[in-house]
C-alpha cells in the first residue's frame, strides 16, 4: 500500500482543516487508514483522523481543531496500521479556504432594485470575520449566456443591483462564494443558491 | 478533593538512586499534564520535568537529562520520577503540580493549580 | 532558556498599604489567542507552593480579589490592593511557554 498523491490539507480557520490524498489502489480508508495530527505546541497530544473514502482510491479527512492561530504548525502521520506511509506538517493559517456564506436571500419589494444579502460564516471573534470579500453569481436559468459575477469589496454582506440590469419576466439564481485577501486564501464553496422571478416596471416611452 | 501526595524520598549516596511517586485524587488524571518541580535548600523554585496527559511527550531540565525518567501510570492516577546517578546538587524538596489539561488539540493551561505537599530527597555520602 | 528577572528582591509593606512585584522576560511570553504564559506562585514559610496569577491576568480559584497580575510580552506585573499579615512569603513568576519552565529569583514580602 503506497501514496500516490501526497496528502494536502486546508483548513476553514474556525474549526475544521479537511486533508485529501489519493492511495495506489482502491482502499478502504476508514478501516486501512489513519491519519495523526498534533499541534506543535509544548504538551500536546496526537490526536486521530478516520479518513472517508473520496472516489475509488482517494481519502479526504476533517481535522477537528479548537482554534487557529497564525503561528500554529501541525505534524502530519498517515499510518496503515503499524506502517508509516507518509509524513509531514502542515501551517493552516497559509492555507485557508473559507467557509461558504450562507443565508442568501434575494429582497425584491426595493423598488425596482434588487437587494441580495447573506451571512457571513464566521463568528465576530473569529479574524476572518472582518476580513472577507464576496462574489456574486447571477445567471438565467433561460438562458446560459447570461451569467454574471458581481465583486464585494466592502465588508458588508449585501448587495444591491438595479432590477432592470436583468431581463424582466424570467427566472434567475444566484450564489454567493467568499475570501479574504489577508491570507490569500482560496475562494471558498458556492452557498446553494436561491432562485426568484425577475418582474418590474418597464418605464414608459415617450412618442 | 482535588489532591496530590508525594512519596519516596529520602537519603541517598551519590551515585544512587530514588523513585518518587505522585499520587492524584479528585480530577481526571489522564487528561492532565503533570509537572515535577525542586527546591534546593534556600533557594528558589526549580523545574525539573514535564510529562504529557498519555505520557507520550516528556521533556526535562538540562540538568537532570539522562539521569532522571518521568512516567505515569494513569490506572493508578499515579506520576513518577525515577531519579538514577544522584548528585549531591540533587538534594531539593521535589513538588509535583497538576499542570496543563491536554485533551483537546491545543492544549488548556490554567497554571500549575494543584502541588503536592513536597517529598525531601538528600544525596550525600 | 527564558531568563525571569524579578524585582524588587525583598519588599517590606506596611499593612493596609498597597505592593507591587515585577517581573521581566528575556522574551516575549505571547502566544496563541493573546494568551501570555507568565504565572504567579506565592510560597508561604514550610508550605508548598500556591497558584495565584496564571496566564498573565487571571485568579486562581479561592484567590483574594486584592490580588491581580497585568502585563503583556515581557513585562509583568503583580499587585496587591491591601496587604495582609498572612500574605508574607515569597513570591515567584514562571514562564511556562516552552521547556524549561523558568522562576524568577522569587520576592519576599514581610510586614513592617
Known amino acids: 500500500m503506497k501514496v500516490l498523491q501526497e496528502p494536502t490539507c486546508v483548513s476553514d480557520y474556525m474549526s475544521i482543516s479537511t486533508c485529501e490524498w489519493k492511495m495506489n489502489g482502491p482502499t478502504n480508508c476508514s478501516t486501512e487508514l489513519r491519519l495523526l495530527y498534533q499541534l506543535v505546541f509544548l504538551l500536546s497530544e496526537a490526536h486521530t483522523c478516520i479518513p472517508e473514502n473520496n472516489g475509488g482510491a482517494g481519502c479526504v479527512c476533517h481535522l477537528l481543531m479548537d482554534d487557529v492561530v497564525s503561528a500554529d504548525n501541525y505534524t502530519l502521520d498517515l499510518w496503515a496500521g503499524q506502517q508509516l506511509l507518509w509524513k509531514g506538517s502542515f501551517k493552516p493559517s497559509e492555507h485557508v479556504k473559507p467557509r461558504a456564506p450562507g443565508n442568501l436571500t434575494v429582497h425584491t419589494n426595493v423598488s425596482d432594485t434588487l437587494l441580495l444579502t447573506w451571512s457571513n460564516p464566521y463568528p465576530p471573534d473569529n479574524y476572518l470575520y472582518n476580513h472577507l470579500t464576496y462574489a456574486v453569481n447571477i445567471w438565467s436559468e433561460n438562458d446560459p449566456a447570461d451569467f454574471r459575477i458581481y465583486n464585494v469589496t466592502y465588508l458588508e454582506p449585501s448587495l444591491r443591483i438595479a432590477a432592470s440590469t436583468l431581463k424582466s419576466g424570467i427566472s434567475y439564481r444566484a450564489r454567493v462564494r467568499a475570501w479574504a485577501q489577508c491570507y490569500n486564501t482560496t475562494w471558498s464553496e458556492w452557498s446553494p443558491s436561491t432562485k426568484w422571478h425577475n418582474s418590474y416596471r418597464e418605464p414608459f416611452e415617450q412618442h | 478533593e482535588v489532591q496530590l501526595v508525594e512519596s519516596g524520598g529520602g537519603l541517598e549516596q551519590p551515585g544512587g538512586s530514588l523513585r518518587l511517586s505522585c499520587a492524584g485524587s479528585g480530577f481526571t488524571f489522564r487528561d492532565y499534564a503533570m509537572t515535577w518541580v525542586r527546591q534546593a535548600p534556600g533557594k528558589g523554585l526549580e523545574w525539573v520535568s514535564s510529562?504529557?496527559?498519555?505520557?507520550?511527550?516528556?521533556y526535562y531540565a538540562d540538568s537532570v537529562k539522562g539521569r532522571f525518567t518521568i512516567s505515569r501510570d494513569n490506572s493508578k492516577n499515579t506520576l513518577y520520577l525515577q531519579m538514577n546517578s544522584l548528585r549531591a546538587e540533587d538534594t531539593a524538596v521535589y513538588y509535583c503540580?497538576?499542570?496543563?489539561?491536554?485533551?483537546?488539540?491545543?492544549?488548556?493551561?490554567?497554571?500549575?493549580?494543584?502541588w503536592g505537599q513536597g517529598t525531601t530527597v538528600t544525596v550525600s555520602s | 532558556d527564558i531568563v525571569m528577572t524579578q524585582s524588587p528582591l525583598s519588599l517590606p509593606v506596611t499593612p493596609g498599604e498597597p505592593a507591587s512585584i515585577s517581573c521581566r522576560s528575556s522574551?516575549?511570553?505571547?502566544?496563541?489567542?493573546?494568551?501570555?504564559?507568565l504565572d504567579w506562585y506565592l510560597q508561604k514559610s514550610g508550605q508548598s507552593p500556591q497558584l495565584l496569577i496564571y496566564l498573565a491576568s487571571n485568579r486562581a480559584s479561592g484567590v483574594p480579589d486584592r490580588f491581580s497580575g497585568s502585563g503583556s510580552g515581557t513585562d509583568f506585573t503583580l499587585k496587591i490592593s491591601r496587604v495582609e499579615a498572612e500574605d508574607v512569603g515569597f513570591y515567584y513568576c514562571?514562564?511556562?511557554?516552552?521547556?524549561?519552565?523558568?522562576f524568577g529569583q522569587g520576592t519576599k514580602l514581610e510586614i513592617k
Open positions: 510529562i504529557s496527559g498519555s505520557g507520550s511527550n516528556t
Open positions: 503540580a497538576k499542570d496543563r489539561l491536554t485533551t483537546a488539540v491545543r492544549p488548556s493551561y490554567y497554571g500549575l493549580d494543584v
Open positions: 514562571m514562564q511556562s511557554l516552552q521547556t524549561p519552565y523558568t
Open positions: 522574551q516575549s511570553l505571547l502566544y496563541s489567542l493573546g494568551y501570555n504564559y
